[in-house]
């Protein structure tokens, strides 16, 4: 884990992140809320909106076409991961070829998980952990042999299951609500400021 002095306004040491957060004017569409202070470059933000982008060669449409309503949550999830300078309290060292740090147990506001889960109910997948177990032989992820495509709710029976399991417990569902100052919002209106700054401060204090 990081020294307790380095929990606020930091970028993780991963594949595409800046070394330090800074303003980034040209952030694309759903990543634009982070433009005042960002860990991602403009080009990363553009790639976050593409299918099978160069970022991770990840195929959202591995079980047929993912609905736009569902896909926008995965784009937002990517924007949060790549751009947020407010995830310091949950950064952990990791021994992986493609990154030195990851996030673990970020307390996502319960409404963000609920909305994600509801909007993906008509989309299909074949796995509950999207970090591992894929067939990458084609250069992008495909369902492994024997993994059947089912609606999201089959692999993620609750919103909590979706948020906690999909990326190896990078997230957990908070009992707190949006606006409480105690949970991270994947979605926010930058006109009203970035609510995750206060959340990071709260947990950084709690950890010190």
């Amino acid at each position: 884990a990081r020294p307790r002095t380095e929990l606020l306004n930091v970028c993780m040491d991963a594949k595409h992140h800046k070394e330090k957060p800074s303003p980034e004017d040209g952030l694309h569409k759903q990543c634009s809320p982070w433009k005042k202070n960002s860990c991602c470059f403009a080009n990363t933000s553009r790639e976050a909106h593409k299918d099978i982008s160069y970022l991770y060669r990840f195929n959202w449409n591995h079980c047929g076409s993912m609905t736009p309503a569902c896909k926008k949550h995965f784009i937002q999830d990517t924007c949060l991961y790549e751009c947020s300078p407010n995830l310091g309290p949950w950064i952990q060292e990791v021994n992986q070829s493609w990154r030195k740090e990851r996030i673990l147990h970020v307390p996502l506001c319960k409404e963000d998980c609920e909305q994600w889960w509801q909007d993906c109910r008509t989309s299909y997948t074949c796995k509950s952990n999207w970090h591992k177990g894929w067939n990458w032989t084609s250069g992008y992820n495909q369902c492994p042999e024997g993994a059947a495509c089912h609606p999201f709710h089959f692999y993620f029976p609750t919103s909590a299951a979706l948020c906690s399991e999909i990326w190896s417990h990078s997230y957990k569902v908070s009992n707190y609500s949006r606006g409480s100052g105690r949970c991270i919002q994947m979605w926010f209106d930058p006109a009203q400021g970035n609510p995750n700054e206060e959340v990071a401060r709260f947990y950084a204090r709690a950890m010190s």
Epitope: E111, Q115, G179, F188, D189
Partner: nanobody, 130 residues
Amino acid sequence: QVQLVESGGGSVQTGGSPRLSCAVSGHTYSRLSMGWFRQAPGKEREGVAGIYTGGPSGPMTYYADSVKGRFTISQDNAQRTVYLQMNSLKPEDTAMYYCAATPQFLIGSGLLRPDKYNSWGQGTQVTVSS
């Protein structure tokens, strides 16, 4: 302060499909959270559907389990109106239906919480008879 005017209620048969409308004035409509709520006699007001109208990815909608698959909330930016299309109505859907709005960015179950809203319409009665 946002002004809201509902219309479209009335008496319908079981299985009917009325559409409620909520006209918005007094606010730049592009970024609002709006909800449809209902209150039957002797019962608490409950959220049935909500929509966040703004943001870089377009509107986001959320539904109570009791109406999922039967009701659809939508918006018409040009008309500054939010609609609730109600299908396959049942007698237990009988209630006064209210439209509510707030400038807060609400999603998920937050869209269905009455305490989150600061502007309310007068309501329109929907009566479902068998």
